[in-house]
């Protein structure tokens, strides 16, 4: 997250970190069910661990943390690497979470976002770009949903209805390491960090997010079919 600020503790209990060995963060994710995460489809990896209830990026033990293995990864059938359409994936955890103040699912919004809606994006991704500099703790950033026209103007021929753009002033954006993390609007999960320009936070080049309102049926049916 570029030019965000430290999230208040316990305010993002659905935020997950996807880790490679040894404790290498590569993506964020979101708890949407006691045993299921949502993340970006481009975050698919064979072997990874899931960390929930953790505030700092470092692997130091925190009393609220819960660690899991991903036992099943189900990318949306319409996703094709390295494209950006349909960029979502469900991950089944090896067991159900223990609900606490630090670990709790969030509901996926069935309503599509309208321009001007205020949202919060969070993650442990780099706070500088193109340099790489990781934060000590989870970062939060207020962003506003942009109209689909502004989105298409920013990225001609690259936007479809499985995506929406959101941004704030120039210099504020999600970035590498934030993929798959939550965009929360009005208390529900509206999007996932997906893609954007490189370096991040360029003027008139907003972040692009997976438009989850288009996928509520697929999410529900996939969880039911695999539970």
């Amino acid at each position: 997250i570029i030019n965000g600020s430290d999230c208040d503790m316990h305010t993002q209990p659905w935020q997950a970190a996807l880790l490679l060995r040894p404790n290498q963060l590569y993506c964020g994710a979101v708890l949407v069910h006691p045993q299921w995460l949502l993340t970006a489809a481009h975050c698919r990896k064979k072997v990874f661990r899931v960390r929930l209830g953790h505030y700092s990026l470092s692997p130091v033990y925190e009393s609220g943390q819960q660690m899991f293995q991903g036992v099943k990864s189900i990318p949306h059938p319409g996703y094709s690497h390295p494209g950006h359409s349909n960029d979502l994936m469900l991950i089944k955890l090896n067991r159900r979470i223990r609900p606490t103040k630090d670990v709790r699912p969030i509901n996926v919004s069935s309503h599509c976002p309208s321009a001007g809606t205020k949202c919060l994006v969070s993650g442990w991704g780099t706070t500088k770009s193109p340099q790489v500099h990781f934060p000590k703790v989870l970062q939060c950033l207020n962003i506003s949903v942009l109209s689909q026209k502004r989105c298409e103007d920013a990225y001609p021929r690259q936007i479809d209805d499985t995506m929406f753009c959101a941004g704030d002033k120039a210099g504020r954006d999600s970035c590498q390491g934030d993929s798959g993390g939550p965009v929360v609007c009005n208390g529900s999960l509206q999007g996932l960090v997906s893609w954007g320009d490189y370096p991040c936070a360029r003027p008139n080049r907003p972040g692009v997010y997976t438009n989850l309102c288009k996928f509520t049926k697929w999410i529900q049916e996939t969880i039911q079919a695999n539970s």
Epitope: L20, Q24, A40, H42, P82, Q176, G177, W195, D197
Partner: antibody, heavy 126, light 107 residues
Framework: EVQLVESGGGLVQPGGSLRLSCAAS????????MNWVRQAPGKGLEWVSY????????YYADSVKGRFTISRDNAKNSLYLQMNSLRAEDTAVYYC???????????????????WGQGTTVTVSS | DIQMTQSPSSVSASVGDRVTITCRAS??????LAWYQQKPGKAPKLLIY???SLQSGVPSRFSGSGSGTDFTLTISSLQPEDFATYYC?????????FGGGTKVEIK
Amino acid sequence: EVQLVESGGGLVQPGGSLRLSCAASGFTFSSYSMNWVRQAPGKGLEWVSYISSSSSTIYYADSVKGRFTISRDNAKNSLYLQMNSLRAEDTAVYYCARDLTSMQSRDYYYYGMDVWGQGTTVTVSS
Amino acid sequence: DIQMTQSPSSVSASVGDRVTITCRASQGISSWLAWYQQKPGKAPKLLIYAASSLQSGVPSRFSGSGSGTDFTLTISSLQPEDFATYYCQQVPIFPYTFGGGTKVEIK
């Protein structure tokens, strides 16, 4: 079959210009970032330039900055390298290479160059 | 710029030998290192990405390890087709930089 084929190399005098082309086939060219990498005779690999899938991000090695221009035409599945003010030290085999990393994607994960052309030879000599 | 230093610059080995090549980055690059194989007159071929992940179609006798600044490419049992030059490359930071190469020759 996934393939990259370079062309446009040749003999040119110092100070001259050349335009290299790289024709891509067998994959969705418009989805991938691309690179030019060169190799001087008997030497190692030297990265020259990078261009993102939509051409919004471009990088050059310091040794070619201000003299070389990378571009692409996604409609033609083609990558280009315009080389001006050529010097003897630019003599090399030039490869185009597909970058597996999408710098647009916001994961923190990097791959490498997974598909390379056969190379085209540029000789700068008087 | 990040400097990549490979060692040794050449190694003589026999079929069946275990060969180890090292690569050192001038600053930490996490796990973001790729290894390539190049045979004379041919283009480089990606062997390993993210320091230890084997590229599709590459034999399992090739393996990579390391993180931060120190990385290793190991060929567990050298085969005749493995005699070539090997390069490491750091990929997260522009300008991308390669190591100087290690030539694996027949003893």
